[in-house]
Interface confidence: medium
């Protein structure tokens, strides 16, 4: 058990953890949750996780999608586990890309 | 309907020990955090002690550390606080609160428990 | 820890009259997600405490509308537009932005 006095009350989320900087954790906690994808490689990257520090959420929710890279931000308990970031593709497809999970 | 239980409370000599009970129905126990705040006779409310969801961080107020450990039974269901070294001034109504979340602290005390009495008296 | 203090100890009040309570922090609200965690709570005697307010000034479900919540900073303010027989009780403010987790020392209304 984990006894702790500290001053700041942080509001926490439990979030969804997918991904290579999870270890072998399959949730993390943070002040907001997020779903990423990005292509690496012509592979599609997908990953779950969460932000610890609120700043450095509020920078990368707030960055739009590009055809490289998308992230979905969100605040809630596991409000992470039912979303799929999505590239603005538009119609387009980027031929020789596949879905690819780290878990 | 969410529900939530004490019980425990009794007269105590000071520097006795008393463990209370809180029994949570009516939501998914474990999602969210517990919090125990209390009330002396005639008085305001005081917040005494928080624990999250899983049960791994856990939170008191200066008058609650080193001698007040909050602990949960999530297979039961269930919220304790273990009191040792009981005062005077720990006589009041002890209320289980929910928390907004599994790791949020106030903010969100809803819903609230109709309380157990602990008197310290010699 | 924060202090808070409410202002006044006592408010009697006419039936169909507004009402307000005042609540000050001892140093400012506003957590590091940049929201303002202070609540208030109404306990009718004999009762537990019930929520109202969440963050300033968000009514908590179910709560009638004649209840607002205002401020900033360290000045906050709780304000029933027209007090009926059953808002009689204790109201207390909380600030949850820090531990511990401190209230106000609740403000009495009652009806003239």
């Known amino acids: 058990m984990e006894d702790e006095k500290p001053k700041v009350n942080p509001k926490l989320y439990m979030c969804v953890c997918e991904g290579l900087s999870c270890g072998n954790e399959d949730h993390c906690e943070g002040q907001q949750c997020f779903s990423s994808l990005s292509i690496n490689d012509g592979f599609h990257v997908y990953q779950k996780g969460c932000f610890q520090v609120y700043e450095q959420g509020k920078m990368t929710c707030k960055t739009p999608p590009s055809p490289g890279q998308a992230v979905e931000c969100c605040q809630g308990d596991w409000c992470n586990r039912n979303i799929t970031a999505q590239l603005p593709t538009k119609g387009k497809s980027f031929p020789g890309t596949q879905n690819f999970h780290l878990e | 309907e969410v529900q939530l239980v004490e019980s425990g409370g009794n007269l105590v000599q000071p520097g006795g020990s008393l463990r209370l009970s809180c029994a949570a129905s009516g939501f998914t126990f474990s999602n969210y955090a517990m919090s125990w705040v209390r009330q002396a006779p005639g008085k305001g409310l005081e917040w005494v002690s928080g624990?999250?969801?899983?049960?791994?961080?856990?939170y008191y107020s200066v008058s609650a550390k080193g001698r007040f450990t909050i602990s949960r039974d999530n297979s039961k269901n269930t919220l304790f606080l273990q009191m040792n070294s009981l005062r005077a001034e720990d006589t009041a109504i002890y209320y289980c609160?929910?928390?907004?979340?599994?790791?949020?602290?106030?903010?969100?005390?809803?819903?609230w428990g109709q309380g157990t009495l602990v008197t310290v008296s010699s | 820890d924060i202090v808070m203090t409410q202002t006044p100890l006592s408010s009697p009040v006419t039936l169909g009259q507004p009402a307000s309570i005042s609540c000050r922090s001892s140093q400012g609200l506003v957590n590091s997600d940049g929201n303002t965690y202070l609540s208030w709570l109404h306990q009718r005697p004999g009762q537990p405490p019930r929520l109202l307010i969440y963050?300033?000034?968000n009514r908590f479900s179910g709560v009638p509308d004649r209840f607002s919540g205002s401020g900033a900073g360290t000045d906050f303010t709780l304000k029933i537009s027209r007090v009926e027989a059953e808002d009689v009780g204790f109201y207390y403010c909380m600030q949850s932005t820090q531990f511990p987790l401190t209230f106000g020392g609740g403000t009495k209304v009652e009806i003239k």
């Open positions: 624990i999250t969801g899983n049960g791994i961080k856990t």
């Open positions: 609160v929910k928390e907004r979340g599994h790791s949020w602290f106030g903010d969100w005390f809803d819903p």
């Open positions: 963050e300033i000034s």
